[in-house]
Amino acid sequence: DASGDLLNTEAHSAPAQRWSMQVPAEVNAEAGDAAVLPCTFTHPHRHYDGPLTAIWRSGEPYAGPQVFRCTAAPGSELCQTALSLHGRFRLLGNPRRNDLSLRVERLALADSGRYFCRVEFTGDAHDRYESRHGVRLRVTAAAPRIVNISVLPGPAHAFRALCTAEGEPPPALAWSGPAPGNSSAALQGQGHGYQVTAELPALTRDGRYTCTAANSLGRAEASVYLFRFHGAPGTST
């Protein structure tokens, strides 16, 4: 909940009563995490139960691109999503209860910026209001974290290892293992946003295989162990 100095309250006087919108000045979150952008409002149309639309846009008020939009039918508390940019935006609040709070999943540094909430009454009480100042979302960089490391069956009774890490900036991944010489060659591919996956395609020897993820904020390591018992392929991790 927003409170104290962080609160922007925006209002205008309608002929009878008053619109207002409450949003925090700023929300901070780490890349890869989720953030909630709070937005509540009051309006002059008592007991309004007609159709309504909730909108969030980025960049600038009134004219910026919409990142989320949902519509609630008359009498309904369900706001059906019509737009969710990249599928990462979800309404947490209930517009019927004057709450437009939005959840943003899988944050990336590029999500930093200002977000503006808007509510539109599209029935008899034809009216709308939009936050002028908005809420500033600050997405901070994240040190690497290895989220999955595993050994999987490969072709011709061989094995391969997969390592998935996340961080912002996206970390560089490297494999090392019992093979003689330098680190084993790894196939690295960019994953979804802040996630990166690297594959070690052929584990030729038993032993410990270590995945290292590094970016400008730090490094992380995780290991798997490969043991093949007699003629029966198997792994121990």
Epitope: A14, R118, T122
Partner: antibody, heavy 122, light 107 residues
């Protein structure tokens, strides 16, 4: 390129009909309310009609209510104005205009077509 | 319907001048007001929306202010390309209505 292009204007006799079209490109047409605004020769601007992004709601100026019908085909990115029972006072340049930032409301018109001239005369 | 009244209806000014055009609404429209510029034979162009927000691409010499019933468009230093007709428009309620226009002419 973001643009609106009107067509369908011309000379018509009083009581006649005309259908104006407005082809949109360069933006997500269905996400925005669209309007028609007209301007009689040497006069100011007059709002004529607005339609919501999905086409479910339409609004008209009293001067054209019952005679004009606004519609849209979002699959073709096209806005229409069907004008029936035309009168001499309907003579004007007709502009189609896009609402800024909303599929329901025209907080302002941020994109205009070049206009098409409709002349009602016998 | 909400009536929009602009003043003056015409104004003569010179390049470099500061010019102010006012628009009055017949009832409170909060800040749901836009300003447009129109040149002969051309479509209107949005300058200001929601009373004071400058439309993208519009020079910063244009500014808008006001709320409720009284609004102002100011051009801080007139340029040759600014000579045109200016309209205000309320979007508070339907029917949307425009002012009668202010013609800005070269002195």
């Amino acid at each position: 390129e973001v643009q609106l292009l009107e067509s369908g204007g011309g000379l018509v006799q009083p009581g006649g009909s005309l259908r104006l079209s407005c082809a949109a490109s360069g933006f997500t047409f269905s996400s925005y309310a669209m309007s028609w605004v007209r301007q009689a020769p040497g006069k100011g601007l007059e709002w004529v009609s607005t339609i919501s992004g999905g086409g479910g709601s339409t609004y008209y100026a009293d001067s054209v209510k019952g005679r004009f019908t606004i519609s849209r085909d979002n699959s073709k990115n096209t806005l229409y104005l069907q004008m029936n029972s035309l009168r001499a006072e309907d003579t004007a340049v007709y502009y189609c205009a896009k609402a800024i930032g909303s599929s329901w409301y025209s907080d302002a018109f941020d994109l205009w077509g070049q206009g098409t001239m409709v002349t009602v005369s016998s | 319907d909400i009536q929009m009244t602009q003043s003056p209806s015409s104004v003569s000014a010179s390049v470099g001048d500061r010019v102010t055009i006012t628009c009055r609404a017949s009832q409170d429209i909060s800040d749901w007001l836009a300003w447009y510029q129109q040149k002969p034979g051309k479509a209107p162009k949005l300058l200001i929306y929601v009373a004071s927000s400058l439309q993208s691409g519009v020079p910063s010499r244009f500014s808008g202010s006001g709320s409720g019933t009284d609004f102002t468009l100011t051009i801080s230093s007139l340029q040759p390309e600014d000579f045109a007709t200016y309209y205000c428009q309320q979007s508070y309620s339907i029917p949307y209505t425009f002012g009668q226009g202010t013609k800005l002419e070269i002195k």
